[in-house]
């Protein structure tokens, strides 16, 4: 059988502005067309997807208008951004690639990438 | 090689449940995922639920609540429990395992949901 192998950083610090980007990379068995890009994450043994787009190879990652998720990609390379992050969202976050069409279809599934989010203290207050 | 056979399909009406089976022979250590898939006639293969190399759990969000998902380990069988099912529930559903994602399929088992 044909694998299909998809990479991503173990781990990730968000900016202190609760933003976070990582590379997705897969290695696929055939030429999609099609692929699906799926962010996950996993709390608590339970996977929920974040954010999700479906983009034409040689075309732009469109997330939905209220994603806190952008992308762009290249060839088998998708840069993701996920954004709004606060130090309660951290967490496991996994990486899903399907190649839609054509046919077969794949599934790949990442190791995920831990992201660390630390909320910023607050401006103490001045005495001027 | 890795061969999966599904089983417990079939015709249910509005409300009902079905648990399906899929066994798996020549199985891998390597194996670290397993899913179940489904196709509706004319529309694209979707992950129904399936058991991450993470540990974790997935569902697609129109089945959160009727359908889980196990796993027994000692007999090398993936289980999908569907309760209150529905009749957009109705497709072929397909068990797929492999390292990290979809290297081994089985032929799939047809799910009727209609009174």
């Known amino acids: 059988c044909k694998a299909m192998h998809v990479a991503q950083p173990a781990v990730v610090l968000a900016s202190s502005r609760g933003i976070a980007s990582f590379v997705c990379e897969y290695a696929s068995p055939g030429k999609a067309t099609e692929v699906r890009v799926t962010v996950l994450r996993q709390a608590d043994s339970q996977v929920t997807e974040v954010c999700a787009a479906t983009y034409m190879m040689g075309n732009e990652l469109t997330f939905l208008d209220d994603s806190i998720c952008t992308g762009t990609s290249s060839g088998n390379q998708v840069n993701l951004t996920i954004q709004g992050l606060r130090a309660m969202d951290t967490g496991l976050y996994i990486c899903k690639v399907e190649l839609m069409y054509p046919p077969p279809y794949y599934l790949g599934i990442g190791n995920g990438t831990q992201i660390y989010v630390i909320d910023p203290e607050p401006c103490p207050d001045s005495d001027f | 090689e890795v061969q999966l056979v599904e089983s417990g399909g079939g015709l249910v009406q509005p409300g009902g449940s079905l648990r399906l089976s899929c066994a798996a022979s020549g199985f891998s250590p390597s194996v670290n995922y397993m899913g179940w898939f489904r196709q509706a006639p004319g529309k694209g293969r979707e992950e129904v639920s399936s058991i991450y190399p993470t540990g974790g759990t997935f569902y697609t969000d129109s089945v959160k609540g009727r359908f889980t998902i196990s796993r027994d380990n000692a007999k090398n069988t993936l289980y999908l429990q569907m309760n209150s099912l529905r009749p957009e529930d109705t497709a072929v559903y397909y068990c797929?395992?492999?390292?990290?994602?979809?290297?081994?399929w089985g032929q799939g088992t047809l799910v009727t949901v209609s009174s």
């Open positions: 797929a395992a492999g390292k990290y994602g979809t290297d081994y």
